[in-house]
Amino acid sequence: GSERTCCPVNWVEHERSCYWFSRSGKAWADADNYCRLEDAHLVVVTSWEEQKFVQHHIGPVNTWMGLHDQNGPWKWVDGTDYETGFKNWRPEQPDDWYGHGLGGGEDCAHFTDDGRWNDDVCQRPYRWVCETELDKASQEPPLL
């Protein structure tokens, strides 16, 4: 594939990544799939600056990110190491709360109204953020 050198229309460039901010809501799996179809992934937060950048753009609204523990341990969707990486959980979170009455616990992470993270039921229809790296090769076939 060819290397992407600029962000697609309606995406925002920041520190060699492109970001797309939804204005509607989807379940985490649907949001994840949406980003994959755009040759991107749900946002992976790796630094204070990236946290602040995303927080600025989403405002005080619950928004999915690319972090989940549906298979046991917490994992970032792009393979970034969770244990050694940036974390910004709200106090007492993640708590895998079962008291919501929707079945199961809470396996997907989202930004809360103050930017800090919470785990929640993956079926909730929250907004989401897609991210793709500018220097990575796109999956589109090269134009002949």
Epitope: E49, K52, F53, F86, K87, N88, W89, P91, G115
Partner: antibody
Framework: QVQLVESGGGVVQPGRSLRLSCAAS????????MHWVRQTPGKGLDWVAV????????YYADSVKGRFTISRDNSKNTLYLQMNSLRAEDTAVYYC????????????WGQGTLVTVSS | DIQMTQSPSSLSASLGDRVTITCRTS??????LNWFQRKPGKAPKVLIY???SLQSGIPSRFSGSGSGTDFTLTISSLQPEDSATYYC?????????FGGGTKVEIK
Amino acid sequence: QVQLVESGGGVVQPGRSLRLSCAASGFTFSSYGMHWVRQTPGKGLDWVAVIWHDGSNKYYADSVKGRFTISRDNSKNTLYLQMNSLRAEDTAVYYCARDDPRSSAGDYWGQGTLVTVSS
Amino acid sequence: DIQMTQSPSSLSASLGDRVTITCRTSQSIFNYLNWFQRKPGKAPKVLIYTASSLQSGIPSRFSGSGSGTDFTLTISSLQPEDSATYYCQQSYSIPLTFGGGTKVEIK
């Protein structure tokens, strides 16, 4: 009401160590990040370090990295700053401040403790 | 590191005057700009956070504006108790950095 009280300041020789404490009350200490900020004599404010509410992240100013360590004991409602290899330019009033998660500004500050590094 | 250029470094104004202090950053910080007031022998106090939000308990004569790299603190009608040094601070990037301060005196 929110109260932050720093202690542990004093006169120390260059190269020596000092540990500052900040006792917090009037709020749920374990729910807030905390900063250390210093005011050098006749000069401005200088951010030193921040620690997350659960200690999961710690960040430092370049001028103190490798010499100072920020830590906290949530069971004691206390924030610490371990200062090693002190230099004359570390002379300052040291303040602890509570972090506002929306802005990362210090929304409440202590009265400060004076550290003087001199031979 | 993000550099903070605050101006003026000092000013003298009369009671009731409108006072404006500016802060310019070396790169965009979106709206992560906070304003503090410091009086001798007292702890610094946050006035404005995220560029324009008034901190609880702060008089409404204080206001903030700006985004990106250019920010302003305005005191709409200077009062005796406003004699102090004012600092801007960016909280977008580590290390957090402060401006050099503006000393406000009453004529």
